[in-house]
């Protein structure tokens, strides 16, 4: 749709075009399967425009339908990652808070591979915090072209 001249002067955030692209900061301590993310121009090609980070987890600030995408590459990866040497390694993206809205949005398994990637459209609400859980003990790559996570507001 075309934007009016007045709309063109507004920052993207005020138009509802919230968007974020994050890179992996670190994995959690023992018994914490979450991945912790970071973003900002000083870090490279990651950024937050609207959404915010809360202790490494992505929090939505505007209601709407979002495209959620993620790619994770394992730095420790084996052709037997999903067989006898390891329990299957699974990546799950979900709303982890508030608890009343907790739900899994994406679930992927590393089937004899080192990289998984997926995306989906889903409604998200202000205050939703997205968590990315990587089961098992395998370490994900922190290379920014191998592991990244983001959301893009699409429509109300």
């Amino acid at each position: 749709q075309r934007l009016s001249r007045a709309q063109q002067q507004l920052p993207l955030e005020s138009l509802g075009w919230d968007i974020a692209e994050l890179q992996l900061n670190h994995t959690g301590p023992q018994q914490d399967p979450r991945l912790y993310w970071q973003g900002g121009p000083a870090l490279g090609r990651s950024f937050l425009r609207g959404p915010e980070l809360d202790k490494g987890q992505l929090r939505i600030r505007r209601d709407g339908i979002y495209m959620v995408h993620i790619q994770v590459t394992l730095a420790i990866c084996s052709s037997t990652s999903t067989s006898r040497h390891h329990h299957p390694t699974t990546l799950a993206v979900g709303i982890c808070s508030p608890a009343s809205r907790s739900i899994s949005l994406l679930r992927l398994s590393f089937h004899q591979g080192c990289t998984i990637a997926s995306q989906r459209l889903t409604p998200l609400a202000r205050g939703d915090t997205l968590c990315t859980n990587l089961t098992g003990t395998l370490l994900p790559s922190r290379n920014t072209d191998e592991t990244f996570f983001g959301v893009q507001w699409v429509r109300p």
Epitope: G28, S79, L138, S141
Partner: antibody
Amino acid sequence: EVQLLESGGGLVQPGGSLRLSCAASGFTFSSYAMSWVRQAPGKCLEWVSVISGSGGRPNYAESVKGRFTISRDNSKNTLYLQMNSLRDEDTAVYYCAKVDYSNYLFFDYWGQGTLVTVSS
Amino acid sequence: EIVLTQSPGTLSLSPGEGATLSCRAGQSVRSSYLGWYQQKPGQAPRLLIYGASSRATGIPDRFSGSGSGTDFTLTISRLEPEDFAVYYCQQYGYSPPTFGCGTKLEIK
């Protein structure tokens, strides 16, 4: 300057236990995965174990799984390797090594090593 | 696990000469995730090359790495006296990471 200093090696009988330590300095210890690599006398290098910067996701070589435990104390900038049920074939120089920031298991800094001898 | 075979086992050369060290993998190394280390007697290994061809910090440009798939090479263009040591290759694309058993570079 990155420095890694191992300690705790020595002579131990088969079936015995030993705890190795590695004191790290010169970098933000909690930001990096750390590893143990060993070298038996006159033999090849062998990767032993790795642990993430936050202390989770330990991984082990099949040869030590169930007998060795890697851990770290980020408040003390120290890496540990608890070795139980030691065998003759565990005799080696044990090196503490810093893992590259990417988490890929190549090692940009190494300690000088500590010798573990398992013998009766 | 991926077996790495280094050749030759020993290489006898003189300072000023060039050296070519080979590392062959039993199966393809993921994304050329292969490194080279130098080890002198009584010392810890030192990282020279990672990603098959990237020099580690502080490594002189006479050291270069090349190769992909299963065949990799470390080249030292002009040998200095301090370059005589044992050289190990290591793959880290698949777990467990594995090392070759080394090439000893000795003074002729």
